[in-house]
Interface confidence: low
């Protein structure tokens, strides 16, 4: 399908203008290509009448031009002038009228309505209210006032001065005669409908001194604005349908090939399944205006929304609409991202995040999409620091890869992580996206002590274990805090070809912290990343308290709380992977130091990834 | 879906009467929240706008070439469009369709979403 998308059908009246607007995908090459504007012949051939190239056919000399606007990815044709004659088929395009790169539009231009001379024209949206004024002359002010709806040859009573009202107008119409001397009687109907569309009569008295005067009431549909998005972006339909329904229910609805209007989201809680996860309905303001953003946009969200009021929270005849025609461009701009995490409870996911690569200044955020009533999505991290405390020690928000992609990882999963996120930032709104993270049946790959608690002072190191599928990853410790985590400086790696050939006591890498001090109290993450690309992480808390007895301190299972998915069999005893290990340095390294005099090469904290023998056992 | 169903085509004498009706049926939305018209094609040529009625009944707009000759109306009980055609000229020899539209704009734009399979009307000198 063409990824060039105009409005369908143009409407208009001899004499006026139109001007219709085509958007592009804006790549290098769309920018700079010709744009057209061109008729459809019988022989199905393409007529250009107006090009960018400053070509204008001569039936369009002086009243046509083509506009492009390569920064927005549109372009804009204006006809001036319009006659019968300019009523058919035509196509806006890029390239060469027969490629295909184009979009057809219908134009239709008729005629105005013949109306009696002297008639008032209003010209109204549906949903709104119309005032028609009518005058009288003073010997008719006494007498009876009425409007009257002209359908075909007859006339039909609509309202009059003696409170009748025809039942078709029942609760939304009303007579104002005003004080004495004001010579004007007007009628105000409310919450228009398509069907109040017509020629009335206003009359005052009756017979051959009555007076008259005609009054044609034009109730319009809205005509649909045009939004063009990329897939898998974000879309944001604000609607404003004015203080008169700032209190009634809003909804937004999708109208099918039925033609009625199903609902997307309302604010009395109901919400189309298809949407789950990514729309949410912004509070109203005060003036009863408010936004829908949908984010993760599929083609098949393509077609005609409608928002609008009423108590029901549904559409219904006679009240306010706004319309919008979503387009969902397929060549998109915004990268392919995992739409789904899955994470095992215990372990981490770390979540690639698009945004605007020429926006990379741009604040970046990670929200919990909420489902409750409306929806909402209470900020997690931001690039600047943590928000939300209960996230503290598990969640980070990192600039890398960089480039257009941020990443956030969160650890420590529990079943009440499962939902769904939003990465978005303080620019541009079009690339929001979600991820919906899902926490599945399986172990961590990465297996650290519980919490730990360190002497001041004294040596510390914190063992972490991976799989054999991790053994070419760069392994890292950092520690956390609420502006990132910091990666800690890595002492030797051991021999390489132990990684290569996934030697049994290559698998561990170890944090030592030599001496540890008050300012080492916290969390640790360990972590694998190929590159710039996060995997998986797991963390520890480090307790520090003071010194009790002088001597070594080897951190052995005993001494630190077990992982959640580990069991603390005996004092030196753990299973991991249903594997017992029996040796108590498992969780040390030799390098531990005696006291606290000397500091082996100056390093307070190190990262080891040795496979020396000392090490003792390994898990399969 | 909407289905419009045309009737009353068939061969007249020039000068002569003849009325078209069509009949809505399937519509999701009720039959008065719809414009209607007439269309029609001659052989070898292109449709072309005829008369439409407004969702109401309340207006009525015609192509100049049967202004005076042709009335639209509408019954809104019976779900039906008729086309009254007096005077018929040879001129007139056409498949007469009826059409529906969701929108409506004033004067005779009628941007159709429905349309019938269309009648027959001949007109013989």
């Known amino acids: 399908k063409s990824p060039v998308f105009g409005p369908q059908e143009v409407s208009s009246v001899e004499g006026n203008s139109v001007s219709i607007k085509c958007y592009y995908p804006p790549t290098s090459v769309n920018r700079h290509t010709r744009k057209y504007w061109c008729r459809k012949g019988a022989s199905g051939r393409c007529i250009t009448l107006v090009s960018s190239e400053g070509y204008v056919s001569s039936n369009y000399a002086g009243r046509a031009n083509l506009t492009n606007f390569p920064e927005n990815g549109t372009f804009v044709v204006n006809i001036a002038q319009l006659s019968r004659d300019d009523s058919g088929h035509y196509k806006c395009g890029l390239g060469i009228n027969s490629r295909g790169l184009s979009f057809d539009v219908s134009l239709e231009v008729s005629q105005g309505p013949e109306l009696p001379n002297g008639t008032e024209v209003y010209t109204v949206d549906v949903g709104r209210t119309v005032t028609i004024k009518c005058p009288f002359k003073t010997e008719n002010a006494p007498k009876t006032k009425a409007l009257y709806k002209k359908i075909g040859q007859t006339s039909v009573l609509v309202i009059d001065s003696r409170n009748y009202v025809n039942p078709n107008y029942k609760d939304r119409i009303r007579l104002r005669i005003p004080g004495t001397g004001q010579l004007i009687f007007t009628v105000v109907i409310d919450r228009l409908r398509l069907s109040d569309h017509g020629l009335y009569l206003c009359q005052a008295g009756d017979g051959s001194n009555r007076d008259e005067k005609n009054a044609d009431l034009q109730v319009l549909e809205p005509e649909p604005e045009l939004v063009y998005e990329d897939l898998r972006g974000s879309v944001t339909f604000h609607c404003a349908l004015g203080l008169e329904v700032a209190n009634v229910a809003k909804f937004l609805c999708r109208v099918n090939s039925r033609e009625t209007c199903d609902v997307v989201i309302n604010t009395l809680g109901k919400r189309d399944s298809a949407f789950e996860g990514r729309i949410l309905l912004n509070p109203q303001d005060k003036d009863g205006s408010f936004s829908v953003v949908i984010t993760g946009l599929r083609k098949e969200d393509e077609g005609r929304y409608l928002c609008g009021a009423h108590s029901d929270g549904q559409l219904q005849e006679g009240w306010p609409i706004q319309a919008w025609q979503l387009f969902v461009n397929e060549e998109s701009t915004i990268p392919r991202s995992p739409t789904v995490v899955k994470g095992v409870a215990g372990g981490s996911v770390a979540v690639l995040c698009p945004y605007n690569p020429k926006e990379s200044q741009s604040l970046k955020y990670w929200c919990l999409w909420e489902g409750a009533q409306n929806g909402r999505c209470p900020l997690l991290v931001e690039s600047q620091g943590l928000v939300q405390e209960q996230y503290e020690g598990r969640l980070s928000l990192l600039q890398e890869p960089g480039n257009g992609t941020f990443t956030v990882i969160l650890n420590q999963l529990t079943t009440q992580d499962a939902g769904f996120y939003w990465c978005l930032t303080n620019g541009d709104t079009r690339w929001r996206t979600t991820v919906e993270i899902k926490i599945i049946e399986g172990e961590p790959n990465l297996k650290v002590p519980g919490n730990v608690t360190a002497v001041l002072g004294e040596t510390l190191n914190i063992p972490c274990h991976f799989p054999c599928k991790f053994s070419s990853y760069e392994k890292y410790w950092c520690k956390w805090s609420n502006t990132g985590c910091q990666t800690l400086p890595s002492q030797d790696e051991g021999p390489s070809e132990a990684f290569v050939n996934c030697d049994e006591n290559s698998r561990l890498v170890s944090l030592t912290l030599n001496p540890v001090t008050r300012a080492d109290e916290g969390w640790y993450w360990c972590g694998v990343k190929q590159g710039h690309f996060y995997g998986e992480t797991a963390a520890v808390y480090v307790a520090v308290e003071e010194k009790k007895v002088a001597g070594s301190r080897y951190v052995s299972p005993a001494k630190a709380d077990a992982a959640p998915d580990e069991k603390v069999l005996d004092s030196g005893v753990r299973e991991i992977e249903n594997k017992a290990i029996q040796d108590p340095r498992l969780f040390a390294e030799e390098k531990v130091v005696a006291d606290t005099g000397d500091q082996a090469g100056g390093s307070r904290a190190s990262v080891d990834s040795s496979s020396s023998e000392e090490q003792g056992g390994s898990s399969k | 879906q909407v289905q419009l169903v045309e009737s009353g085509g068939g061969l007249v004498q020039a000068g002569d009467s003849l009325r078209l009706s069509c009949a809505a049926s399937?519509?999701?939305?009720?039959?008065?929240?719809?414009?209607m018209a007439w269309f029609r094609q001659a052989p070898g040529k292109e449709r072309e706008f005829v008369a439409s009625?407004?969702?109401?009944?309340?207006?009525?707009y015609y192509a100049d070439s049967v202004r005076g000759r042709f009335t639209v109306t509408r019954d809104s009980g019976k779900n039906t469009v008729t086309l009254r055609m007096n005077s018929l000229k040879p001129d007139d020899t056409a498949v007469y369709y009826c059409a529906s539209a969701q929108y409506w704009r004033s004067g005779t734009s009628f941007p159709a979403n429905y349309w019938g399979q269309g009648t027959l009307v001949t007109v013989s000198s």
């Open positions: 009625i407004t969702y109401n009944g309340g207006s009525t």
């Open positions: 399937g519509r999701a939305l009720s039959f008065n929240t719809y414009a």
